[in-house]
């Protein structure tokens, strides 16, 4: 129950995570004008990794896109890439996850390979939510040298007479979105990792064999030290139907064609 | 068709108040912020400040603060612009005009005439 | 605040001939976030409201004839009016609306010989 819902939990954190990344990826404010000597101002810009745009204090909005590849920065070019991967990582860890999900029956799929496809959703979404945070971060590092080196020449011209006041720009809500929801998918990678280890059935993958003595009714199971001692992923008894391993009382009370009287 | 009917002259004594109204039609009067612009006689045109309909929050030109009170009645498309301790030196026309495309005003009210005398 | 300074303060001209004034701000006009001006020019005729002419220093407001032209970036700018008709006479303002408090210049009066 515990693993379910360990599983469960983290494939929602992911989803959460995910959406949050391509919501960021999305948005226009990545960075914003920095109003702090002038918190009214009648031009309010802000630029996103697609487009920049102005917002006028007559209401009007004004966007345009970036049209050119060649022509930006090294460094959007890297963060863009780095939150491309990270979504496409994530969407692809989201599908193998619904997959894996063992809440979800499919077929005959045996518990191995969902712990499988467990592992390596939550290693998606760990490289997913690394990839958001690294992009993120890239840009509030480009962002804040920009803002100091704006602010050691803040205003330029002709004898002082002339004032070009240069726009200085901070983080604005598309890193913070970002940066949680980065966050987000790399918990929820966890999450889904710790739970692929308790999915994983730890002794070899034999068929049951019970051998009926004289005296007493004793199933012996294949796998050592782990089976006989009560340890593994199956203390509880838990019915498993997956063909294969099955617990003691039921190897017992269900004779089949694999036992051999 | 865009419309800004603004109330009539007024004639004040110096030291007293008054409450010019400006009555927008033919738009959704939240939508756009309200300016309010001072012409002295035979002189240049000075922005007094403007007010979001919406929220109701004013913008102030830091010369008119304490001087001009903006407000709205969301109820009537009305812009209000209360003057207070008027003076000699308030006696203008007065001018509400809406906001366009680069925080310009392309529609203007008819003026209102406010003269302080004693 | 922004100060706009325009000159000449008034100018007479004969109807047809081609006009220029100019208006100056003390800083920069230019945002360079869309690299638009945020100068305007407003025409004012005896007894009647401004009427605005151009927005971003050089794109006309509609109605307004293409005899009106703005130029000019940054802290310089120019309105020119092609060929004067006689319904030009008027005071033309510019207006700094890049930044808080909105400031008009003291205007040019354009009269007609």
């Known amino acids: 129950m515990a693993v379910t819902a360990c599983q469960g939990l983290g494939f929602v954190v992911s989803l959460i995570g995910i959406a949050g990344i391509i919501a960021a990826t999305c948005m226009d404010q990545w960075s914003t004008q920095d109003l702090y000597n002038n918190p009214v101002t009648a031009v309010f810009n802000y630029q996103g990794l697609w487009r920049s745009c102005v917002r006028e204090s007559s209401g009007f909005t004004e966007c345009r896109g970036y049209f050119t590849l060649l022509g930006l920065p090294a460094m959007l070019q890297a963060v863009r890439a780095l939150m491309i991967v990270g979504i496409v990582l994530g969407a692809i860890g989201l599908l193998v996850s619904i997959f894996a999900l063992k809440c979800i029956r499919i077929g005959s799929m045996e518990d191995s390979a969902k712990a499988n496809m467990t592992l390596t959703s939550g290693i998606m979404f760990i490289v997913s939510g690394l990839c958001a945070i690294a992009g993120v971060s890239v840009f509030a590092n480009m962002l804040v040298t920009n803002f100091w080196m704006s602010t050691a020449n803040m205003y330029t011209g002709m004898g002082g007479m002339v004032q070009t006041v240069q726009t200085r720009y901070t983080f604005g809500a598309a890193l913070f979105v970002g940066w949680v929801a980065g966050g987000l998918t790399l918990i929820g990678g966890v999450m889904m990792c710790i739970a692929c280890r308790g999915l994983a059935p730890e002794e070899t993958n034999y068929k049951a064999v019970s051998y009926h003595a004289s005296g007493h009714s004793v199933a012996y199971k294949p796998g050592g030290f782990k089976a006989s001692t009560g340890f593994g992923s199956n203390t509880k008894n838990k019915k498993i139907y997956d063909g294969g391993a099955r617990t003691e009382d039921e190897v017992q009370s269900y004779p089949s064609k694999h036992d051999y009287v | 068709e865009i419309q800004l009917q603004q109330s009539g002259a007024e004639l004040v004594k110096p030291g007293a108040s008054v409450k010019i109204s400006c009555k927008a039609s033919?738009?959704?009067?939240?939508?756009?912020?309200m300016n309010w612009v001072r012409q002295s006689h035979g002189k240049s045109l000075e922005w007094i400040g403007n007010i979001d309909p919406y929220y109701g929050s004013p913008t102030y030109n830091h010369k008119f603060k304490g001087k001009a009170t903006l407000t709205v009645d969301k109820s009537s498309s009305t812009a209000y612009m209360q003057l207070i301790s008027l003076t000699s030196e308030d006696s203008a026309v007065y001018y509400c005009?809406?906001?366009?495309?680069?925080?310009?005003?392309?529609?203007w009210g008819q003026g209102t005439l406010v003269t302080v005398s004693a | 605040d922004i100060v706009m300074t325009q000159s000449p303060s008034s100018l007479t001209v004969t109807a047809g001939e081609k006009v220029t004034m100019s208006c100056k701000s003390s800083q920069s006009l230019l945002n360079s976030g869309n690299q638009r001006n945020y100068l305007t020019w407003y025409q004012q005729k005896p007894g009647q409201p401004p009427k605005l002419l151009l927005y971003w220093a050089s794109t006309r407001e509609s109605g307004v004839p293409d005899r009106f032209t703005g130029s000019g970036s940054g802290t310089d700018f120019t309105l020119t009016i092609s060929s004067v008709q006689a319904e030009d006479l008027a005071v033309y303002y510019c207006?700094?609306?890049?930044?808080?408090?909105?400031?008009f210049g003291s205007g040019t009066k354009l009269e007609i010989k």
């Open positions: 207006q700094n609306d890049y930044s808080f408090p909105f400031t």
């Open positions: 033919g738009y959704s009067f939240t939508d756009y912020h």
């Open positions: 005009a809406n906001y366009g495309r680069g925080n310009s005003f392309p529609y």
